[in-house]
């Protein structure tokens, strides 16, 4: 099997963890995606998922979590608002593609917050420009219920579906070792 | 290569406002972040806050929150910083820096500040 | 806000010198740090992101370690274009900060 790579992300209770996931563009930009939890020897558990077919850059609000899928440019954009210690563990991004098994897209993030401490600037939600403000129009997709076994103990073998060069001038070295920074207040 | 061209130095007096722009070529802007960062005469690197233009919203740091409004328009590949209220101490250089988009193997928006405009002289003297 | 410190503040040193640069967090932030180069009446140029990972084009005589709360920037044998001064730059958390800069000076 292929070994999963994991992105640590390190928060604290209060903030925002902002995430973007790829993928490649003519192959996924309509597919339904979707934002799952990995508890320990469970099968992948969804928490939410963009509409079927996905719409470009249309808010879907899922309690904290809000998803939006920017097809343009091949970006999923994940947010979990107002994060709850209870929040930590094991995330990552899938695109539904029945009736084949969901396709996940790398890497793996595995979420820990802890507790904040009170009066640290920058710690809350109101710490940022507007970047955290819920949208006033969200849908709730309904997600399909079934969530692939495979997930769990393997990831798809990589392809360049799952990893293309960068955009522009900066030849990051090391592809697998590349800098995991959240974007988050 | 992305090349960043920023607005030319500016005098302004107590109270008034600034506005700076960094134009990009060369590389994928939209989905990229746009950060601005300044620095005072002598003194080290402060950041002031950033932007993904396809979100359309900024964040900034809150020691400038209230006080600074950074934008971008995708249609000409240029981030603006409008920093309001000016006092003395506002003096800097004030520079905005690019991080490409790197698509798969990663989450994250900013990960380096690897491509840096030539910097804007912004003087608060009444 | 996370506080970097860095330290030494100055250092002088001579072409061929083994030089090293530390950086403190004031809170754990894996790996997620940034150096920087900055010569006078320049912008700021990156060396190093991911702690240890060298950006492209910058000569391998760089290099960066550490995870957590203490970093390092190593140059291992310091060239006349080197002199210059060094700042660290957290990407853990908003907003990002600096380090108050190293200035390495030719002795």
């Known amino acids: 099997a292929t070994k999963l790579t994991e992105e640590k992300y390190e928060l604290k209770e209060g903030q925002t963890l902002d995430v973007k996931c790829d993928y490649t563009l003519e192959k996924f930009a309509s597919s339904q995606k979707a934002w799952q939890i990995i508890r320990d020897g469970e099968m992948p558990k969804t928490l939410a998922c963009t509409e079927r077919p996905s719409k470009n850059s249309h808010p879907v609000q899922v309690g904290r979590i809000i998803l939006e899928d920017y097809h343009d440019h091949g970006l999923l954009r994940v947010r979990m608002v107002n994060l709850q210690v209870e929040d930590s563990g094991l995330y990552q991004c899938v695109i539904y593609q029945p009736p084949k098994e969901p396709h996940m897209l790398f890497d793996r993030i595995r979420l820990v917050v802890t507790k904040g401490f009170s009066g640290t600037p920058g710690s809350n939600e109101n710490s940022t420009q507007n970047v955290y403000k819920i949208p006033p129009t969200t849908t709730k997709a309904l997600c399909p219920l079934y969530t692939s076994p495979r997930t769990v103990t393997q990831a798809p073998p990589k392809s360049t579906a799952d990893v293309s060069t960068p955009d522009s001038e900066i030849n990051l070295t090391n592809v697998t070792d590349i800098i995991r920074v959240p974007v988050f207040n | 290569q992305v090349q960043l061209v920023q607005s030319g130095a500016e005098v302004k007096k107590p109270g008034s406002s600034v506005k700076v722009s960094c134009k990009a070529s060369g590389g994928t802007f939209s989905s990229s972040a746009i950060s601005w960062v300044r620095q005072a005469p002598g003194q080290g690197l402060e950041w002031m806050g950033g932007?993904?233009?396809?979100?359309?919203?900024?964040d900034s740091a809150q020691k400038f929150q209230g006080r600074v409004t950074i934008t971008a328009d995708e249609s000409t590949s240029t981030a603006y910083m409008e920093l309001n209220s000016l006092r003395s101490e506002d003096t800097a250089v004030y520079y905005c820096a690019f991080t490409p988009r790197y698509r798969g193997s990663s989450h994250h928006y900013f990960y380096a500040l690897g491509v840096w405009g030539q910097g804007t002289t912004v003087t608060v003297s009444s | 806000d996370i506080q970097m410190t860095q330290s030494p503040t100055s250092l002088s040193a001579s072409v061929g010198d083994r030089v090293t640069i530390t950086c403190r967090a004031s809170?754990?932030?894996?790996?997620?740090l940034a150096w920087y180069q900055q010569k006078p009446e320049k912008a700021p140029k990156s060396l190093i992101y991911?702690?240890?990972s060298l950006q492209s084009g910058v000569p391998s005589r760089f290099s960066g370690s550490g995870s957590g709360t203490d970093f390092t920037l190593t140059i291992s044998s310091l060239q006349p274009e080197d002199f210059a001064t060094y700042y660290c730059?957290?990407?853990?958390?908003?907003?990002?900060?600096f380090g108050g800069g190293t200035k390495v000076e030719i002795k």
């Open positions: 991911a702690a240890s």
């Open positions: 932007i993904i233009p396809i979100f359309g919203t900024a």
């Open positions: 809170q754990g932030i894996s790996s997620w």
């Open positions: 730059q957290q990407f853990n958390s908003y907003p990002l900060t």
